[in-house]
């Protein structure tokens, strides 16, 4: 998916009150300093691709994060203000139906949160260069 | 089952407001954005815009941006479409329709409508 | 916004035929087109969503095809019941659009 036409500012917004703090939950008791970023993005589009693909693409060591609460408002997001978005979901969701896993909370996980974190905050200041 | 039930007809003076309530039940209010549609008398159907309680934002057509709000209460899983300023071609039925936002992605339940009248 | 046109506006038809309507898309909008049927006093009712993606409890004479700019509702032998306004609908971005509508009535 090209998220080259989706509604940034209404992403960027979603984001700020509500996403963000989500994502600050479930690192809750973990120290900031604790994971390097090593996932970087250059531009808005770009920082969707990675974010989708950290959220929801099933990695070693940490099965799924797609049920978690900055999930699902991730989904509704980029369903709602990303043109055709939605429709290629349809297909996906029904195969996450199949493969609903309990949630559980790896070190793994914590890492790839942290990643998403620092995606989320280069997608809101996108006019920075990139170090 | 799922039901998406609107308050009465309405009766409104040029000028005034209208407050339109879509009361849901039947399924997980956060799960669907609450979408309004409204259809004049023998006329297409037009949207006006979404409420999204997951994420606690709302989303306009540019045709009525600064008079419709909609809002919803969670709590009691009410959603609500005020249309401010009316005129006579206001005069019309008001829907509320759920949509999913994390899945089925299309607007598969309606409530009955709203028929509000504009007249002096 | 992006403009759907149906066509015909509308199609008198006898029961047992077979009806064919079309909605054309202002621009390319994939498969993100819904198809809905309403009768008089009646809200809307979803038949097919995704283009073609059925429904449950929607007869299996109701079918959906298209992508792109071009979509087609056809139901295959109508039934009395079937004579209505059908309406196409785009969710691929907003303002969310719909067609003009499609009456379908009793030749």
């Known amino acids: 998916y090209d998220f080259t036409n989706c509604d940034f500012e209404k992403i960027k917004a979603a984001y700020l009150s509500t996403i963000s703090k989500d994502l600050i939950t479930y690192m809750s008791g973990t120290k900031s300093t604790e994971f390097n970023n090593t996932v970087s993005c250059s531009n808005r589009p770009h920082c969707l691709t990675e974010i989708q693909s950290l959220t929801f693409n099933p990695t070693a060591g940490c099965a799924s994060l797609a049920k978690e609460m900055f999930a699902m408002k991730t989904k509704a997001a980029l369903a709602i203000w990303c043109p055709g978005y939605s429709e290629t979901q349809i297909n996906a969701t029904q195969a996450m139906k199949k493969a609903r896993k309990s949630k559980v909370t790896t070190n793994k996980c914590l890492e790839q949160v942290s990643q998403l974190q620092g995606l989320w905050r280069r997608f809101n200041r996108p006019l920075l260069k990139q170090q | 089952q799922v039901q998406l039930v609107q308050s009465g007809p309405e009766v409104k003076k040029p000028g005034s407001s209208v407050k339109v309530s879509c009361k849901a039940s039947g399924y997980i209010f956060t799960d669907y954005a609450m979408h309004w549609v409204r259809q004049r008398p023998g006329q297409d159907l037009e949207w006006m815009g979404t409420?999204?309680?997951?994420?606690?934002?709302?989303d306009y057509n540019q045709n009525f941006k600064g008079r419709a709000t909609i809002t919803a209460d969670k709590s009691t899983s009410t959603a609500y479409m005020e249309l401010s300023s009316l005129r006579s071609e206001d005069t019309a039925v008001y829907y509320c329709?759920?949509?999913?936002?994390?899945?089925?992605?299309?607007?598969?339940?309606w409530g009955q409508g709203t028929l509000v009248t504009v007249s002096s | 916004e992006i403009v759907l046109t149906q066509s015909p506006g509308t199609l008198s038809l006898s029961p047992g035929e077979r009806a064919t309507l079309s909605c054309r898309a202002s621009?390319?909008?994939?498969?993100?087109v819904h198809w809905y049927q309403q009768k008089p006093g009646e809200a809307p009712r979803l038949l097919i969503y995704?283009?073609?993606q059925s429904i449950s409890g929607i007869p299996d004479r109701f079918s959906g095809s298209g992508s792109g700019t071009d979509f087609t509702l056809t139901i295959s032998r109508l039934e009395s019941e079937d004579f209505a306004v059908y309406y196409c609908q785009q969710s691929y971005s907003f303002p969310y659009t719909f067609g003009r509508g499609t009456k379908v009535e009793i030749k």
């Open positions: 621009q390319h909008i994939s498969r993100s």
């Open positions: 409420f999204i309680p997951l994420l606690d934002t709302s």
């Open positions: 329709a759920r949509m999913g936002v994390t899945h089925s992605y299309v607007m598969d339940a």
């Open positions: 995704f283009a073609s």
